[in-house]
């Protein structure tokens, strides 16, 4: 089931899904001056089963001036540099996404895609948080959030992460950064 909202925002931190659960949607969005091709897909969907999942549909953008011209999905290096996402630019630890059954990898960029990717997650999705450059992590627990179903409603768990400026002193002296593995917490659904 779709999560009604996004993972919680942590000041000076970004989140990243290491892999996307089957059922996740990614909006097909184009950058300014470009539009979806005529009859182009509205979104990509991670489909499949526990053994193999892949992204259904393809996002394609075309110049607003030339509405019907199809642009192929080949990323331009200079465009990729300018693309920001709400997620982290580099994963916190190497993860073999293909080894996670029922999950899809990060979809490859498409030409002239929007600067921010908007994913719609499903129950059981886990995302990992990392402080942005110039800030360091103070952990009280796992720096991750899971979308859970409770009493028929979806909610994200609160990540136990505080990002502090490099010059600030730790509020949690002696606290060590936990080694969070991608399967570190079960993707459980709570029922009532």
């Amino acid at each position: 089931e779709l999560c009604d909202d996004d993972p919680p925002e942590i000041p000076h931190a970004t989140f990243k899904a290491m892999a996307y659960k089957e059922g996740t949607m990614l909006n097909c969005e184009c950058k300014r001056g470009f539009r979806r091709i005529k009859s182009g897909s509205l979104y990509m969907l991670c489909t499949g089963n526990s053994s193999h999942s892949s992204w259904d549909n393809q996002c394609q953008c075309t110049s607003s001036a030339t509405r019907n011209t199809t642009k192929q999905v080949t990323p331009q290096p200079e465009e990729q540099k300018e693309r920001k996402t709400t997620e982290m630019q580099s994963p916190m630890q190497p993860v073999d996404q293909a080894s996670l059954p029922g999950h899809c990898r990060e979809p490859p960029p498409w030409e002239n895609e929007a600067t921010e990717r908007i994913y719609h997650f499903v129950v059981g999705q886990m995302v990992y948080y990392q402080c942005v450059q110039g800030y360091r992590a103070l952990h009280r627990g796992p720096a991750e959030s899971v979308c859970k179903m409770t009493h028929g409603k979806t909610r994200w768990t609160q990540p136990q992460l505080i990002c502090t400026g490099e010059m600030e002193t730790s509020q949690f002296p002696g606290e060590e950064k936990p080694q969070a593995s991608p399967e570190g917490r079960p993707e459980s659904e709570t029922s009532c």
Partner: antibody
Framework: DVQLQESGAELAKPGASVKMSCKAS????????MHWVKQRPGQGLEWIGY????????EYNQKFKDKATLTADKSSSTAYMQLSSLTSEDSAVYYC????????WGQGATVTVSS | DIQMTQTTSSLSASLGDRVTISCRAS??????LNWYQQKSDGTVKLLIY???RLHSGVPSRFSGSGSGTDYSLTISNLEQEDIATYFC?????????FGGGTKLEMK
């Protein structure tokens, strides 16, 4: 809870314009498209267009391109639709609805065009 | 534009019945088919998206199936609260288009 609260019923004269609103709550407004859908009495549903409140990017059904203008105000989490040059054909219930798969709908706002 | 056709505009059923409502697209829509329920007061709810995925909070008696151009919505054990009009909608490409609706009534 996700909620979309539409403005009240509108009575307008032919040739006039109306602007209806849709106040969103219970989710991050800028992360979901906002669609608008028309339903004439006793008839089916017609998609008018959508706006991405984050970027103000809009897409319209060609049929409504010159009729509807979609806008959004991030600060108040409110989407708007203005209908211009009203005729009796524009008398209908208009719904705002959010999302990629259009998962939550407003209660509908009735527009009546009459002289 | 893709045309969506619901050939049955109204159908009568009894409590506990298994009801199937069908929908046909004018071209292959690759499973990007949603089902909506509209109550007599105008309230619209998403029931199923992408052919068979149940939206949160929707009772499990609702199910969807189909592929290519032909799709169906099944209510396995009809309840009084299911009396409504049901619309299919293709959500693959713009403009999203709706079927004409099937009004479900009690016998």
């Amino acid at each position: 809870d996700v909620q979309l609260q539409e403005s009240g019923a509108e009575l307008a004269k032919p040739g006039a314009s109306v602007k209806m609103s849709c106040k969103a709550s219970g989710y991050t407004f800028t992360r979901f498209w906002m669609h608008w859908v028309k339903q004439r009495p006793g008839q089916g549903l017609e998609w008018i267009g959508y706006i991405n409140p984050s970027t103000d990017y809009t897409e319209y059904n060609q049929k409504f391109k010159d009729k509807a203008t979609l806008t959004a105000d991030k600060s108040s989490s409110t989407a708007y639709m203005q209908l211009s040059s009203l005729t009796s054909e524009d008398s209908a219930v208009y719904y705002c609805a959010r999302g990629t798969v259009v998962d939550y709908w407003g209660q509908g706002a009735t527009v009546t065009v009459s002289s | 534009d893709i045309q969506m056709t619901q050939t049955t505009s109204s159908l009568s059923a009894s409590l506990g019945d298994r009801v199937t409502i069908s929908c046909r697209a004018s071209q292959d829509i690759s499973n990007y088919l949603n089902w909506y329920q509209q109550k007599s007061d105008g309230t619209v709810k998403l029931l199923i998206y992408y052919t068979s995925r149940l939206h949160s909070g929707v009772p499990s008696r609702f199910s969807g199936s189909g592929s290519g151009t032909d799709y169906s919505l099944t209510i396995s054990n009809l309840e009084q609260e299911d009396i409504a009009t049901y619309f299919c909608q293709q959500g693959n490409t713009l403009p999203p288009t709706f079927g004409g609706g099937t009004k479900l009534e009690m016998k």
